[in-house]
């Protein structure tokens, strides 16, 4: 048999004006009951009984997972990155089959010199992390490689990485135009064929706090939103205080339902409170309105 759970009641008035005696369980949310062995608990909304208490799924909390949290943890990555797939042609080195073998002395030496050269080229770009050769092929040496960029996550990270990729393009174009062979020899660390420089692809980290917030809010996705504090995104409902979108319930309690945030107005010994924001007080003794 199902165990009966005592439910405390509070005298609250809905913003529509009628007095209701509400259990601490939100009656507007669907109820699913989780039973483990002889233990039974009214763990709602997908929550489960762990033998001691209900383990609730986001965005629910409470003794029976009946309440909706006011804020949901979203965790943007500390850093975001971009990967540029580039091809350049090095003319100051003659291709040999050994260069195909990444464990050969030839490859290691080429990799060291090429990396050193690219570190010089991109030295002024704060987002620059390094280069990674993916393939070497004949012609003299066609170098397929990735340029790796990284920056701290901010709401404007895409702009920062987009700008960095543009600077990479400018710098590699400049060096492969200037460092060319003269009299069949190279006086630079490496020389290039100007026409062999190509940007094949650019991949940027995709992180959208709004999307993560909506996904975690599940059926409440339309009522949770993202606000920023100190460049950090917060996934909040209007019931979370201290944000621009916070709902002021004055003489009442903000509660989430599947229809959004609503104010449950309190009744005190001296006043009834009503209105959408529980800001209309009626004195019990004189029935006098205060605004």
């Amino acid at each position: 048999p199902l165990a009966t759970i005592p439910v405390s009641t509070t005298s609250l008035t809905s913003s529509e004006g009628s007095t209701i005696s509400t259990p601490s369980v939100d009656i507007s949310t669907p109820v699913t009951t989780s039973i483990v062995g002889d233990q039974c608990s009214r763990c709602k909304n997908g929550g489960f009984w762990d033998g001691l208490k209900c383990q609730c799924l986001t965005p629910y909390y409470g003794e029976s997972c009946e309440e909706v949290v006011n804020s949901i943890d979203i965790a943007p990555p500390e850093t975001v990155s971009a990967q540029m797939e580039l091809t350049v042609t090095v003319t100051s080195v003659k291709f040999t089959d050994e260069l195909k073998n990444h464990s050969s002395q030839e490859f290691r030496e080429f990799n060291k010199t090429f990396t050193e050269q690219m570190n010089i080229v991109y030295s002024g770009i704060p987002e620059y992390v390094g280069v990674n050769i993916t393939n070497l092929r004949l012609g003299s040496v066609v170098v397929e490689h990735d340029v790796l960029l990284r920056t701290k996550y901010t709401p404007e990270y895409k702009t920062a990485l987009d700008n960095a990729t543009e600077v990479v393009k400018q710098k590699i174009t400049k060096v492969t135009t200037e460092q060319i062979m003269t009299n069949d020899n190279c006086s630079a660390l490496m020389c290039f064929n100007t026409t062999g420089t190509q940007v094949q692809n650019i991949t940027v980290t995709q992180y959208d706090p709004v999307e993560e917030c909506r996904q975690k809010a599940e059926e409440y996705e339309d009522y949770f939103l993202v606000e920023y504090r100190d460049q950090k995104p917060y996934c909040i409902s209007p019931c979370e205080s201290g944000f621009n979108a916070s709902k002021n319930c004055n003489h009442g309690k903000c509660q989430m339902s599947q229809n959004g945030a609503r104010c449950l107005c309190v009744t005190t010994e001296t006043h009834w409170y009503s209105g959408e924001d529980c800001n209309q007080g009626t004195q019990k003794s004189h029935h006098h309105h205060h605004h």
Partner: nanobody, 124 residues
Framework: EVQLVESGGGVVQPGGSLRLSCAAS????????MAWFRQAPGKEREVVAF????????YYADSVKGRFTISRDNSKNTLYLQMNSLRAEDTAVYYC?????????????????WGQGTMVTVSS
């Protein structure tokens, strides 16, 4: 680890000859470029000549063309520089350099392995 040891330097009169040698050891590859660079007092290091492993390419600086000859004996892992008609301006420390790559560069920074150098003084 690759090691390069030069020998054959010394004092010679203008118009005289010298033969420098460079013994290479520690190479795992049988294909590599070798070069001679030199550095005169107060000047930057400059290329004298280089040669590819198979002798398929040689390069000479304009200042030594027709007077110096670079060669190598792969069986002995040794590089040579035959210097004829020496001039006072050839006075410098001569360095042997190597790379496992077939380098076509005269920039010393592109060459990863270096010997300690041997002094050549041309003076009357």
């Amino acid at each position: 680890e690759v090691q390069l040891v030069e020998s054959g330097g010394g004092v010679v009169q203008p118009g005289g000859s010298l033969r420098l040698s460079c013994a290479a050891s520690g190479y795992t590859s049988n294909r590599y470029s070798m070069a001679w660079f030199r550095q005169a007092p107060g000047k930057e290091r400059e290329v004298v000549a280089f040669i590819w492993t198979d002798g398929g390419r040689t390069y000479y600086a304009d200042s030594v063309k027709g007077r110096f000859t670079i060669s190598r004996d792969n069986s002995k892992n040794t590089l040579y520089l035959q210097m004829n008609s020496l001039r006072a301006e050839d006075t410098a420390v001569y360095y042997c350099a190597a790379s496992s790559l077939l380098l076509q560069t005269i920039n010393p920074r592109a060459w990863p392995y270096w010997g300690q150098g041997t002094m050549v003084t041309v003076s009357s």
